[in-house]
Amino acid sequence: VTCDDYYYGFGCNKFCRPRDDFFGHYACDQNGNKTCMEGWMGPECNRAICRQGCSPKHGSCKLPGDCRCQYGWQGLYCDKCIPHPGCVHGICNEPWQCLCETNWGGQLCDKDLNYCGTHQPCLNGGTCSNTGPDKYQCSCPEGYSGPNCEI
């Protein structure tokens, strides 16, 4: 039995005609099975295969090889969260977080908790103590005074 064009199988009861449009992107094998074009997958070959490494959780694509990030995610593979706007010395595990690095505090991680170590403000052998975010106190040796033992 010879089947009409695009019909396959015993009894010619399977239809497959190649297409490359909204409904699918496929060719047909000798048995009438759809064989997806490169970059496409799914039963109807209408689901794009994203860039290799594209986060399955936070990235997606409508065209093969693409990787479009969900809101709050960034990077080539959409695997990097976007921290809170204005976050200075912080990172995120989830979008819009600002988790401060060591010795930084405040909502935007812009307050120095180790002012003494970062700026070494005490002069003339003064001893520096961190007293709060962006705050310090100098204990001056005998013969020196002033906020930074500069006098």
Epitope: D4, Y6, Y7, C12, F15, R17, D21, F22, F23, G24, G42, P43, E44, N46, R47, K62
Partner: antibody, heavy 116, light 107 residues
Framework: QVQLVQSGAELKKPGASVKVSCKVS????????IHWIRQAPGQGLEWMGI????????KYAQKFQGRVTMTVDTSTSTAYMELSSLRSEDTAVYYC?????????WGQGTLVTVSS | DIQMTQSPSSLSASVGDRVTITCRTS??????LTWYQQKPGKAPKLLVY???ILAAGVPSRFSGSGSGTDFTLTISSLQPEDFATYYC?????????FGGGTKLEIK
């Protein structure tokens, strides 16, 4: 088994909007597109549009462009069809259906009546 | 848009008759044509898809033929349960338009 279960009948006033739901079960929701078809009393079938359930992309018949919105909620395997600026001619049974090579599976239909 | 012309719009026939319904399209749709049967108050039922493939569970007295622009649905020997309205529909490109329907009534 594959099932498409639609929301109940609606009575709407002219100018209002209606949103019909179609909850599917028995297969992977994002594997197949959902179509919406309507049938006015005593009339034939009219294709309204299709939505790709994986991406949420939709294509509408020109007649409904600007008035119809098709959406999906993949978390509940539900498709929605919203028709706005209703008029009396929109009184019809609205069906959702699944398929690419014709519609093997249909919802039971939702009667939408538009009357003042 | 592709226009679907279905004929006849109504048809009277008797049990045991051979019945043919035709559908003509305004442009080549290859074999992207489907036939449905609808009974009052029910959703349509898929009979034939891709012009000539019988859907699962459909009796063999139904058959479809044609390609390009001219298509036919044939019921070889009408049964009482076949009296209904029949629709063709193309699924070649958007929009997937339907034919106007053929109401098959008992003579």
């Amino acid at each position: 088994q594959v099932q498409l279960v639609q929301s109940g009948a609606e009575l709407k006033k002219p100018g209002a909007s209606v949103k019909v739901s179609c909850k599917v079960s028995g297969y992977a929701f994002t594997d197949y597109a959902i179509h919406w078809i309507r049938q006015a009393p005593g009339q034939g079938l009219e294709w309204m549009g299709i939505i790709n359930t994986y991406y949420g992309d939709s294509k509408y018949a020109q007649k409904f462009q600007g008035r119809v919105t098709m959406t999906v909620d993949t978390s509940t395997s539900t498709a929605y069809m919203e028709l706005s600026s209703l008029r009396s001619e929109d009184t019809a049974v609205y069906y959702c259906a699944r398929g690419y090579d014709g519609f093997a599976y249909w919802g039971q239909g939702t009667l939408v009546t538009v009357s003042s | 848009d592709i226009q679907m012309t279905q004929s006849p719009s109504s048809l009277s026939a008797s049990v045991g008759d051979r019945v043919t319904i035709t559908c003509r399209t305004s442009e080549n749709i290859y074999s992207y044509l489907t036939w449905y049967q609808q009974k009052p108050g029910k959703a349509p039922k898929l009979l034939v898809y891709n012009a000539k493939i019988l859907a699962a569970g459909v009796p063999s007295r139904f058959s479809g033929s044609g390609s390009g622009t001219d298509f036919t649905l044939t019921i070889s020997s009408l049964q009482p349960e076949d009296f209904a309205t029949y629709y063709c529909q193309h699924h070649y490109d958007i929009p997937w338009t339907f034919g106007g329907g053929t109401k098959l009534e008992i003579k």
